[in-house]
Interface confidence: medium
């Protein structure tokens, strides 16, 4: 069982590349929706929950028309990277209550990472300017209580759901311009 072949595959049509990224984003959106519902079943949310360290929603769906591809991908990458760090943090510091969301939360982390890598490669294949290296992220403070961890989980999954929904719409719209 030797290693896989080394050379990268020939660059496919950017529209096909974007299609596969949309598929991956839709799949992750479905995972997130399911996990958020699971969380609500176990720990019903009392109103909306926010976390100051989460990115603000990139754009309302109505404002998508003015977007350009580099801006969408750069912003999406930055926001999803923030959510990846928050999911990692949640799994480390969220407390025993959130262990009931495993292994689904771990699967979500791995798929989110895969989507980020796909976006990065898409930016490379489309010859878009690469963002500068991310500075080391400041560590997130642990939740003050078990309930604080649950509130954080509601905020993270809810925000990720909105971001991925925006991403699918944005990527589909941009595909028509390629």
């Amino acid at each position: 069982p030797g290693p896989p072949p080394g050379p990268p595959r020939v660059s496919p049509d950017p529209r096909a590349e974007l299609d596969s990224t949309v598929l991956l984003t839709r799949s992750l959106l479905a995972d997130t929706r399911q996990l958020a519902a699971q969380l609500r079943d176990k720990f019903p949310a009392d109103g909306d929950h926010n976390l100051d360290s989460l990115p603000t929603l990139a754009m309302s769906a109505g404002a998508l028309g003015a977007l350009q591809l580099p801006g969408v991908l750069t912003r999406l990458r930055a926001d999803l990277l923030s959510y990846l760090r928050h999911v990692q943090w949640l799994r480390r510091a969220g407390g025993s209550s959130l262990k009931t969301l495993e292994p689904e939360l771990g699967t979500l982390q791995a798929r989110l990472d895969r989507l980020l890598r796909r976006l990065q490669l898409l930016m490379s294949r489309l010859a878009l300017p690469q963002p500068p290296p991310d500075p080391p992220a400041p560590p997130l403070a642990p939740p003050s209580s078990a309930w604080g961890g649950i509130r954080a989980a509601h905020a993270i999954l809810g925000g990720l759901h909105l971001t991925l929904d925006w991403a699918v719409r944005g990527l589909l719209l941009l595909k028509t311009r390629l």
């Epitope: 050379p7 990277l81 799994r91 480390r92 791995a110 490669l121 490379s124 690469q130």
Partner: antibody
Amino acid sequence: QVQLQQSGGGVVQPGRSLRLSCAASGFTFSSYGMHWVRQAPGKGLEWVAVISYDGSNKYYADSVKGRFTISRDNSKNTLYLQMNSLRAEDTAVYYCARIMGYDYGDYDVVDYWGQGTLVTVSS
Amino acid sequence: QSALTQPRSVSRSPGQSVTISCTGTSSDVGTYNYVSWYQQHPGKAPKLMIYDVSKRPSGVPDRFSGSKSGNTASLTISGLQAEDEADYYCCSYAGFYTWVFGGGTKLTVL
């Protein structure tokens, strides 16, 4: 066969700079991502940086971010590590290493390593 | 990223089996099936022995095998031989283009 020939190590004072090189042969260099990994004396391995096959994507360990720059010249089959603002804790043997394959980045595992070059940061 | 945890040293007699553990967290070993193992003889460059948790590159004897359970990966060497005496390092992908290595395990074949 795959060969990674390293050079550029030596003794340098804290705060100064050094550039390491890694000349590749025996494979199509421009088709492979590359890592730098280091090993402090008597210690374990530490990942430092990675670069994609075409040089467009670069990532760094937090411990070197903003000080080290990984780059490559595919026309010369050479990988580089520019190290600025060096500190005593950067003292280590530095290895360049080839990634097994690069497509969607599922295979970022190292399959071949250079012989290593020692960097000593001391006043 | 913190280093993965490995035993500092293990020793066995020739012909015996040994298992070296590598414990990480839910953010690295526990999430990603990208664990590799390297063998390093003194003064030499590391050599890939296992990748993607349990796959063996061509040329590596089938005495070497890898597995993973939860946040812990393991390397098992059966039928130990004198030339297996070396340092062994595990490595895990740790999310969005970062990797973390273990501190290393010195294997002594008595």
